[in-house]
């Protein structure tokens, strides 16, 4: 068991330009507050759960009304530490959220108004009974300048809070096996006090007066070998004449869960599954309600309607997770069409659209002929967010202006001459070539492969292509 | 919305079985524990069985009255909630109804089981 | 096992303000219980009103509320209707455990 304690140096505008408006004005005097969440270790599935290792709300501190035209100075703060007791081990990872709150006292209907100010997030390795850690952090434009600690309640001590220390009975030194209690030297690491009688060999314990069975173990002092031997009832008495011996209650036998915690066994003990609101090695750490206010960056509180829910946070656009703790990456749901660029801006989603595109989401597709005119008759093809011309012949370019050299593609095969033509071009074949681009060889019978030239026209004659 | 619906109701023989089935859809079933209550003709409310979600260990309750009678299960998977009711009593002749509790209640429709002989 | 028990009939008028009451024989209903209440109008229609003791579903007129009173979970109408006319349950958690009120059975004149 120990305690958490974090101590709030300051709360002001952060370093740069933009510096952040006061949030109190002598119209809207004000106060501040923080909470603080910590959840064990520092995996992401952290994000989604309640704030399991606890959760702590501040004093509100002195009164404080803006003077008019000064920049937003460091902020009054409540007086004294933020501390979040713990009873179980410290976990050595944590995470942590922080959130300045202001209070409003103007005349508001209903008593104060709060809202959020600024929330910091972070995840950090700590070891109980070390120094205090310093740490800054920043929220837009603000910053928070704050330290920590963990320190354990005596007797625990350790970097988890897990080894008791007890006074020395000798002055000098302590007992067979046990180590002076650092940093308190002049105690000395007591040993669990274990179920009298306990199996030293096969027993163990993780609280003081119980006596818990290595596998393969039974009785209430470890002292029973388990058979292996087939025996009539699933759980029940030993019979001593057989030396047959059935296991005797588990340790999830009467569920040791309290407040509707699930029991699971493991190998050495049982772990309990707690519903939301509860913690603890046997959920019997009541935690969270609504009156804690464990609703992040604005959530709406309200109590559920199920033991599994004791409470619903209500998220605001933008957050998520069971204490809307979670920022949403709205820009991963591709809400913006047609290759639009998507925007987070924290209030509000902004899509960057593509050239052809408009619409909050780029989702109309703008008339890429509209007020587009081809120049010299060509038609306009819309496609792709751009428009693109169909030129008439003799003409090229984006819009058709430009006027084409249709011989510049060097369009006659076999060696035919190209003339540009008003409406095309014309090829002058080779002999033994005809067509419209020289294309088809003339037989050497004098007879062609296409039919016959049109009349006024005899193979070999340019051809005109149409 | 949240839609919630019975089917497997039936005319059933005392000492008999039946299986009743309830398809969710509209929300994240597999986050949420679930319940089955009942209404006898003429009578009030009576809760049957609950299931909590798969952190929880799926773990089940009972009402006294049904007690290793009835088994509730889930499949997550096609968001499913079932009731196996074995040795059928007169007494469970009921309108049984799928319930969800979150931050209210949420009813489905109902299924009619009658057991006569 | 608790017992849950409400008034078996109440009688109000249009307009005038009607307190339904949930008392647990196991002691003070807390906000723990989750208190939870039903309208069940004919033909076997239910309709979730308050989650949680005070939470009200969406599409459910402002006049229900819900609300601990003294040792007891309540649930207030505010300037009844004729379309209020129904049996009211109120439901109770005990850990996993729920138990039901025989139910109220609510006229409107």
């Known amino acids: 068991a120990g305690v958490f304690e974090l101590q709030i140096h300051s709360f002001g505008p952060g370093p740069g330009p933009g510096a952040p408006r006061s949030p109190c004005s002598a119209r809207l005097p004000c106060r501040l507050f923080f909470r603080v969440c910590l959840k064990p270790g520092l995996s992401e599935e952290a994000a989604e759960s309640p704030c399991a290792l606890g959760a702590a709300l501040s004093a509100r501190g002195p009164v404080y009304t803006e003077q008019p035209g000064a920049p937003a100075p460091d902020l009054p703060l409540p007086d004294g530490l933020l501390q979040v007791p713990f009873r179980d081990a410290w976990p050595g990872t944590f995470s942590f959220i922080i959130e300045t709150w202001r209070e409003e006292l103007g005349d508001q209907i209903g008593g104060p108004a709060w809202s959020l100010l600024a929330r910091v997030a972070g995840r950090r390795r700590l070891a109980a009974g070390g120094p205090w850690a310093r740490d800054i952090q920043r929220a837009g434009a603000w910053e928070l300048r704050f330290s920590y600690r963990a320190r354990c309640e005596p007797p625990a001590v350790g970097t988890a809070c897990t080894r008791l220390c007890r006074p020395r009975s000798a002055p000098s030194r302590c007992g067979p096996g046990l180590r002076p209690c650092a940093p308190l030297e002049d105690e000395c690491e007591a040993p669990l006090v274990c179920r009298a009688g306990c199996s030293p060999e096969h027993g163990f314990c993780e609280q003081p007066g119980e006596c818990r069975c290595l596998e393969g173990w039974t009785g209430p002092l470890c002292t029973v070998p388990v058979s292996t031997s087939s025996c009539l009832s699933p759980r029940g008495p030993s019979s001593a004449t057989t030396g047959c011996l059935v296991p005797g209650p588990g340790p999830c036998d009467g569920n040791p869960c309290a407040n509707g915690g699930s029991c699971s066994e493991t190998p050495r003990s049982f772990e309990c599954t707690c519903p939301r609101g509860f913690y603890g090695l046997r959920c019997e750490v009541s935690g969270v309600t609504c009156a804690d206010g464990p609703c992040f960056n604005g959530g709406l509180c309200v109590g559920g309607a199920d033991p599994d829910s004791a409470y619903i946070c209500h998220c605001p656009p933008g957050f998520q997770g069971s204490n809307c703790e979670k920022r949403v990456d709205r820009c991963s749901l591709q809400p913006c069409r047609n290759g639009g660029l998507c925007l987070d801006l924290g209030h509000a989603l902004r899509c960057r659209c593509r050239a052809g595109f408009a619409g909050p989401r780029c989702e109309h597709d703008l008339d890429d002929c509209a007020g587009r005119a081809c120049a010299n008759g060509g038609t306009c093809v819309e496609g792709g967010g751009a428009h693109r011309c169909s030129c008439a012949l003799g003409f090229g370019g984006r819009d058709c202006r430009e006027r084409a050299d249709p011989c510049a593609a060097r369009p006659c095969a076999h060696g035919g001459r190209c003339y540009a033509h008003f409406s095309g071009l014309v090829c002058a074949c080779a002999p033994g070539y005809m067509g419209a681009r020289c294309e088809f060889p003339v037989h050497p019978d004098g007879a062609s492969a296409l039919p016959a030239a049109p009349p006024g026209l005899r193979p070999g004659d340019p051809q005109r292509y149409l | 919305e949240v839609q919630l619906v019975e089917t497997g109701g039936g005319l059933v023989q005392p000492k008999g079985s039946l299986k009743l089935s309830c398809a969710v859809s509209?929300?994240?079933?597999?986050?949420?524990?679930m319940n089955w209550v009942r209404q006898a003709p003429g009578k009030g409310l009576e809760w049957v069985a609950r299931?909590?979600?798969?952190?929880?260990?799926?773990?089940?309750y009972y009402a006294d009255s049904v007690k290793d009678r009835f088994t509730i299960s889930r499949d997550d998977s096609q968001s499913m909630l079932y009731l196996q009711m074995n040795n059928l009593k007169i007494e469970d002749t009921a309108m049984y109804y799928c319930?969800?509790?979150?931050?209210?209640?949420?009813w489905g429709q109902g299924t009619l089981v009658t057991v006569s002989a | 096992q608790a017992v849950v028990t409400q008034e078996s009939a109440l009688t109000t008028s249009p307009g005038e303000t009607v307190t339904l009451t949930c008392r647990s024989s196991?002691?003070?209903?807390?906000?723990?219980?989750?208190a939870n209440w039903i309208q069940e109008k004919p033909d076997h229609l239910f309709t979730g009103l308050i989650g949680?003791?005070?939470n009200r579903a969406p599409g459910v007129p402002a006049r229900f509320s819900g609300s601990l009173i003294g040792d007891k979970a309540a649930l207030t109408i505010t300037g009844a209707q004729t379309e209020d006319e129904a049996i009211y349950f109120c439901?109770?958690?005990?850990?996993?455990?729920?138990?039901f009120g025989g139910g109220t059975k609510l006229t409107v004149l």
């Open positions: 949680g003791t005070n």
């Open positions: 299931i909590r979600n798969k952190s929880n260990n799926y773990a089940t």
């Open positions: 439901g109770l958690w005990y850990s996993n455990h729920l138990v």
């Open positions: 509209a929300f994240t079933f597999t986050t949420y524990a």
């Open positions: 196991t002691g003070a209903v807390t906000t723990s219980n989750h």
């Open positions: 319930v969800f509790y979150y931050d209210y209640v949420y």
